[in-house]
């Protein structure tokens, strides 16, 4: 019962997380114009992974897509890639986990197969969550770098007269959505992996017991009734779990110019 609950909850948490990752990827507010300590403008700028937008006081909003691939910063491309990989892995993970759910019966699927699928989907969710967190963090790092760069030369004047106030960008709502969604997907994946342990049929290794019948000696080895599951011995199970723990990607982020509009 606890295993079913853990698996079901893991699935639901991951589903919410992946929906959040998709939402964050599509959102336009990855970076928003910094209003703090800036002259109040009648125009508000914000940018996403796919387009930049301008909202006027009049209520009119104009968005322009980045209709170039080669002209965009490598970091932005990397963030796009991480988010898409996260979505794809998460979507596959969801598909696999639906069939792995204990409460859903598909033909004569054995528990061992469900355990395998639960573990696979769990690993996929973990990697998906890590991709989203990494993508959002790389973008956030890029923003911080550019924020301080633009603060350093915020007022570029000629002859002492201020000419330009450079638009500074700060964290947009999509970053927070992405971080939370990535975290939820990660937690969901961990829950699926935990549920997998409970689903795995453990082979009970009894010591061989000798029954001495009159006249001749026959040795019975009980416990072989679970051998038909095809899941292998406990030592083999442990190997699978160890493999699942080695999925963390180390992502290093480097400062990059973010002004891609």
């Amino acid at each position: 019962m606890a295993v079913t609950a853990c698996q079901g909850l893991g699935f639901v948490v991951s589903l919410i997380g992946i929906a959040g990752i998709i939402a964050a990827t599509c959102m336009d507010q990855w970076s928003t114009q910094d209003l703090y300590n800036n002259p109040v403008t009648a125009v508000f700028n914000y940018q996403g992974l796919w387009r930049s937008c301008v909202r006027e006081s009049s209520g009119f909003t104009e968005c322009r897509g980045y209709f170039t691939l080669l002209g965009l910063p490598a970091m932005l491309q990397a963030v796009r890639a991480l988010m898409i990989v996260g979505i794809v892995l998460g979507a596959i993970g969801l598909l696999v986990s639906i069939f792995a759910l204990k409460c859903i019966r598909i033909g004569s699927m054995e528990d061992s197969a469900k355990a395998n699928m639960t573990l696979t989907s769990g690993i996929m969710f973990i990697v998906s969550g890590l991709c989203a967190i990494a993508g959002v963090s790389v973008f956030a790092n890029m923003l911080v770098t550019n924020f301080w760069m633009s603060t350093a030369n915020m007022y570029t004047g000629m002859g002492g007269m201020v000419q330009t106030v450079q638009t500074r960008y700060t964290f947009g709502a999509a970053l927070f959505v992405g971080w939370v969604a990535g975290g939820l997907t990660l937690i969901g994946g961990v829950m699926m992996c935990i549920a997998c342990r409970g689903l795995a049929p453990e082979e009970t290794n009894y010591k061989a017991v000798s029954y001495h019948a009159s006249g001749h000696s026959v040795a019975y080895k009980p416990g072989g009734f679970k051998a038909s599951t095809g899941f292998g011995s406990n030592t083999k199970n442990k190997k699978i779990y160890d493999g699942g723990a080695r999925t963390e990607d180390e992502v290093q982020s480097y400062p990059s110019k973010h002004d891609y509009v």
């Epitope: 930049s52 009049s58 002004d259």
Partner: antibody
Framework: EIQLVQSGPELKKPGETVKISCKAS????????INWVKQAPGKGLKWMGW????????TYAEEFKGRFALSWKTSASTAYLQINNLKNEDTATYFC???????????WGQGTTLTVSS | DIVMTQSPSSLTVTAGEKVTMSCKSS????????????LTWYQQKPGQPPKLLIY???TRESGVPDRFTGSGSGTDFTLTISSVQAEDLAVYYC?????????FGAGTKLEIK
Amino acid sequence: EIQLVQSGPELKKPGETVKISCKASGYTFTNYGINWVKQAPGKGLKWMGWINPNTGETTYAEEFKGRFALSWKTSASTAYLQINNLKNEDTATYFCARLYYGNRFDYWGQGTTLTVSS
Amino acid sequence: DIVMTQSPSSLTVTAGEKVTMSCKSSQSLLNSGNQRNYLTWYQQKPGQPPKLLIYWASTRESGVPDRFTGSGSGTDFTLTISSVQAEDLAVYYCQNAYYYPLTFGAGTKLEIK
């Protein structure tokens, strides 16, 4: 046809209060902001502030904070400019104008002349 | 506040002449997000409310004769009337439509000989 029709001329004494109206027609009133502009006799245009009838948000120019209040009534499609504790320097023509995209004032009221005199 | 400086304060021309008036802002009115200059030009004839001529520094409002042209970027802007007509007698105002308060210039008074 889009129109902004303002209330008639006002003659007031210092210290009194006046409320100028600006009735909009020909468009959805709540979709566009209303700006107020002051023009003293023989002088240029001075932006006073604006109101967003959709959200009720108001923005005032620094010199028009305090005695000046912008309000609106959606059911009447009307924006209002109220000036409290009138002073002689409030003598001017007050215009309302619709805020359209490009942050431009595309339609203007005919103007309301306010005279403050003791 | 953003200061809008218009020059000349007044000019007298004969009908058919080309006229140019300048408007300078104390800060750039160019928005990096959409590469548009938030500067607007208005025409005010005696006893009338102002009329919108040009927005986004160079986009002519519908119904405005094509003899009116707006140009410039950043802090320096120009309104050109290619062939002045008698009905163009008015005061022309430029306005900052980017920063609050949305300040106007002092105006350029156009008189016809």
